[in-house]
């Protein structure tokens, strides 16, 4: 028997520095978690103690904090190299700055293989990107070899900006021939490493013949055996065992997100490469694990540029950006309109000639808008200003909801109107009319939504049974502010870009902004 230790991360999303327990900015260092310096300490400890160790990342290192905004992926290559990752799969967010934003900072600088079997380059890009990512890589580990085959969510064209010269194939269809190729090379221990979410991970384990282990990402799935060490609630045991169609027991793992945990899986193989046993658990990277001093020093060196960046002008406003709770929790506010417009703009993807865009709607809880921006400071808007408006370090995500769920969400928006509560929704691509004289749960009298399957966008009445795409804060997707119906009834949820980054990019693009209050939210006569 031969034993392999798989250490794995996924959806780190730019959390290079340690964070608070909820993965936002670290405030009290004695209670902070994660970060690459702490991760390195634990990885090194395991490498010294155990013989056959692989450190793998299942994608979405890109996007999530000011680190990515400023360094654009160079920080990912640098610190992943420093941690000596053995392989990485491409995630959807690796394409957020286009293909060039992946090639130059990461693919050309990474000293480890970057993998995806289901992304095929065509046209002029094919030769440019040749060799910079691979479908699979065979890694010598001790006296054995292990094949790692990569995969990426085929939804990436809807979630990011991969351009027109990359084709995202079905994961299972693309993986099988690559696994077969590895088998012909006499590689009998194969790990599928990828970024398509837990449901697809399980399908791969079930359907792809020859895959021994699946290491996944994208769905931020937390698996744990025993009593979980922090706030995350396990979606199942670690590893999650799937019985493949050919009768094998295939362990599937994922390690939550944001570098809070280091996945730790021990696999025992027999001489024919069959998995005899698998066990482990994610390791919580809390303050009991010291930060490695040399990596920490490097982090501090790279930090300097971030501090300078946050005070630089991104663009100008020529109007007052009303982000006050007195406005945003009671009525349409122009800060809400600005943020929603930025959210839609960030999701412009012309992937189908029938649609001007794949998504037209935005909802945003008024309580998530934490500050106004005064235009009387020469109109200047900085990252620092935006961090006061959006201080929680959230993301703007893409969900699919039925019209009936959206109707419930808008009823919830005003179910206790007048108490300055955070659930009052700001919108984009939606016209809503409330009648507050009616009883809670029956106050939405008109709800029109902007069409997507149209050449000239116009507002049509919401259809209860239709499925709509909506951009919203991850806070709402997770049922925050009482929006349990969104969490319970959403049909799909893909995590998006950092909230501040979305707004800052939009302001930089527009250069000068002047959002208005324009009748997106109305109250019917006599009730307000």
């Amino acid at each position: 028997a031969w034993e392999l230790t798989i250490l794995h991360t996924n959806d780190v999303h730019s959390r290079l520095e340690q964070t608070s327990e909820d993965s936002s900015k670290c405030v009290n260092a004695s209670r902070c978690m994660g970060g690459v310096a702490r991760l390195f300490t634990k990885v090194q400890q395991i490498r010294r103690a155990e013989p056959n160790v692989l450190l793998l990342d299942a994608g979405d290192q890109y996007q999530g904090t000011i680190w990515f905004t400023v360094y654009k992926g160079a920080e990912v290559a640098h610190f992943m190299n420093a941690l000596r990752y053995d392989a990485m799969a491409l995630g959807n967010h690796e394409f957020d700055n286009g293909v060039e934003g992946l090639i130059e900072p990461l693919l050309k600088e990474a000293k480890f293989p970057i993998l995806s079997a289901n992304i095929k380059a065509k046209g002029p890009l094919a030769s440019q990107i040749s060799g910079l990512y691979l479908p699979y890589k065979v890694l010598p580990v001790g006296d054995e070899v292990v094949g790692i085959v990569g995969y990426t969510s085929k939804e990436t064209p809807f979630l990011s900006n991969p351009g027109t010269n990359l084709v995202f194939e079905d994961e299972i269809t693309a993986l099988q021939p690559e696994v077969d190729k590895l088998k012909t090379l006499n590689v009998n221990k194969i790990i599928a490493l990828g970024h398509s979410g837990f449901e697809m991970d399980k399908l791969i384990a079930q359907k792809v013949r020859g895959v021994d282990v699946v290491v996944g990402g994208h769905s931020n799935t937390f698996l744990y055996t025993g009593n979980p060490p922090s706030k995350e609630v396990p979606a199942g045991k670690y590893p999650f065992i799937v019985t493949s169609d050919d009768g094998r027991k295939v362990p599937v793992v994922q390690a939550y997100a944001f570098g809070k945990y280091l996945g730790y899986l021990k696999i025992e193989f027999d001489e024919r490469g069959n998995v005899i046993s698998s066990h482990g658990n994610p390791i919580l990277l809390n303050s009991s694990i010291p930060e490695d001093p040399s990596i920490k020093a490097d982090i501090n060196k790279w930090r300097i540029k971030l501090d300078n960046y946050s005070t630089q002008e991104l663009g100008k406003t020529i109007v007052y950006l009303d982000g006050s709770s007195q406005s945003c929790r009671f009525r349409e506010c122009n800060m809400g309109n600005l943020i929603c417009d930025a959210m839609i703009n960030n999701n412009l993807r012309h992937t189908d000639e029938m649609f001007w865009n794949h998504v037209s709607m935005c909802i945003l809880n008024g309580g998530g808008i934490r500050s106004p921006i005064d235009e009387r400071n020469n109109g200047t808007i900085t990252w620092e200003n935006l961090a006061a408006v959006l201080p929680f370090g959230g993301t703007f995500d893409l969900v699919q909801l039925k019209g009936s769920t959206l109707k419930k969400a808008f009823e919830h928006s005003v179910h206790r109107y007048g108490q300055s509560t955070g659930e009052f929704l700001q919108v984009g691509g939606i016209h809503v009319v409330y009648d507050l004289s009616r009883k809670p749960g029956d106050r939405v009298v008109k709800l029109d939504v902007l069409c997507t399957k149209c050449r000239v966008p116009s507002y049509d009445p919401l259809k209860m049974d239709e499925v709509y795409k909506v951009i919203l804060p991850n806070f709402l997707a997770n049922g925050g502010d009482g929006f349990q119906m969104i969490k319970d009834e959403l049909l799909r949820h893909d995590s998006g870009d950092q909230d501040i980054n979305v707004v800052s990019t939009y302001i930089s693009k527009m250069k000068v902004i002047y959002p208005a209050v324009e009748g997106r939210i109305k109250f019917s006569t006599g009730s307000h």
Partner: antibody, heavy 122, light 110 residues
Framework: EVQLVESGGGLVQPGRSLRLSCAAS????????MHWVRQAPGKGLEWVSG????????GYADSVKGRFTISRDNAKNSLYLQMNSLRAEDTALYYC???????????????WGQGTTVTVSR | QSVLTQPPSASGTPGQRVTISCSGS????????VNWYQQLPGTAPKLLIY???QRPSGVPDRFSGSKSGTSASLAISGLQSEDEADYYC???????????FGGGTKLTVL
């Protein structure tokens, strides 16, 4: 300036041993995997052995497996090749080579020393 | 006998474009990236191309690499007399678990 300087070559009888050393300077040694590559007189290049940044992963060409041992001392910025049971066909110029990565099986070889000559003869 | 196959020699006149081929199998070039090395007479080899088509800094853009299937090629345009050297391709081999080189191509500038 990045430099690799090999030493330890010489004339040795078949069946005997020799230890080659390579002193590295001008870069952070433990950031890189290292290799030994040889070139027989008038012939092409042949990879001999590779070692990852922390000695955690090591590989050998079939022609030297079981006879040669690669090692490194990161504290001394040094790479070594212990050659036992030497044969006439081991006669070659031995290059110390830096990998472009910290794993010897990825990225290729980006910096080469000038080589040290090993002659195996009676 | 080298694992990767290169023509033993190639030639061209100054200013011309020459191409050197390198043929392998599914376990080396077919699965991994290709590197090219230049060895000027009496000197150590030097990295010319890595990851199929990437040039290290300092290598003129007259040198370019490409890969297709289990073969790779090195193209040198605007040939100069100082390009006279031996050229070697190399790739990691997943079956042999080691680096393999081509036998080398001696380029003569006429």
């Amino acid at each position: 300036e990045v430099q690799l300087v090999e030493s330890g070559g010489g004339l040795v009888q078949p069946g005997r041993s020799l230890r080659l050393s390579c002193a590295a300077s001008g870069f952070t040694f433990d950031d890189y995997a290292m290799h030994w590559v040889r070139q027989a007189p008038g012939k092409g290049l042949e990879w001999v052995s590779g070692i990852s940044w922390n000695s955690g992963s090591i590989g050998y060409a079939d022609s030297v497996k079981g006879r040669f041992t690669i090692s490194r001392d990161n504290a001394k910025n040094s790479l070594y090749l212990q050659m036992n049971s030497l044969r006439a066909e081991d006669t070659a110029l031995y290059y110390c080579v830096r990998s472009g990565s910290y794993n010897y099986y990825y990225y290729g070889m980006d910096v080469w020393g000038q080589g040290t000559t090993v002659t195996v003869s009676r | 006998q080298s694992v990767l196959t290169q023509p033993p020699s190639a030639s061209g006149t100054p200013g011309q474009r020459v191409t050197i081929s390198c043929s392998g199998s599914s376990s080396n070039i077919g699965s991994n990236t290709v590197n090219w090395y230049q060895q000027l007479p009496g000197t150590a080899p030097k990295l010319l191309i890595y990851s199929n088509n990437q040039r290290p800094s300092g290598v003129p853009d007259r040198f370019s690499g490409s890969k297709s299937g289990t073969s790779a090629s090195l193209a040198i345009s605007g040939l100069q007399s100082e390009d006279e050297a031996d050229y070697y391709c190399a790739a990691w081999d997943d079956s042999l678990n080691g680096w393999v080189f081509g036998g080398g191509t001696k380029l003569t500038v006429l």
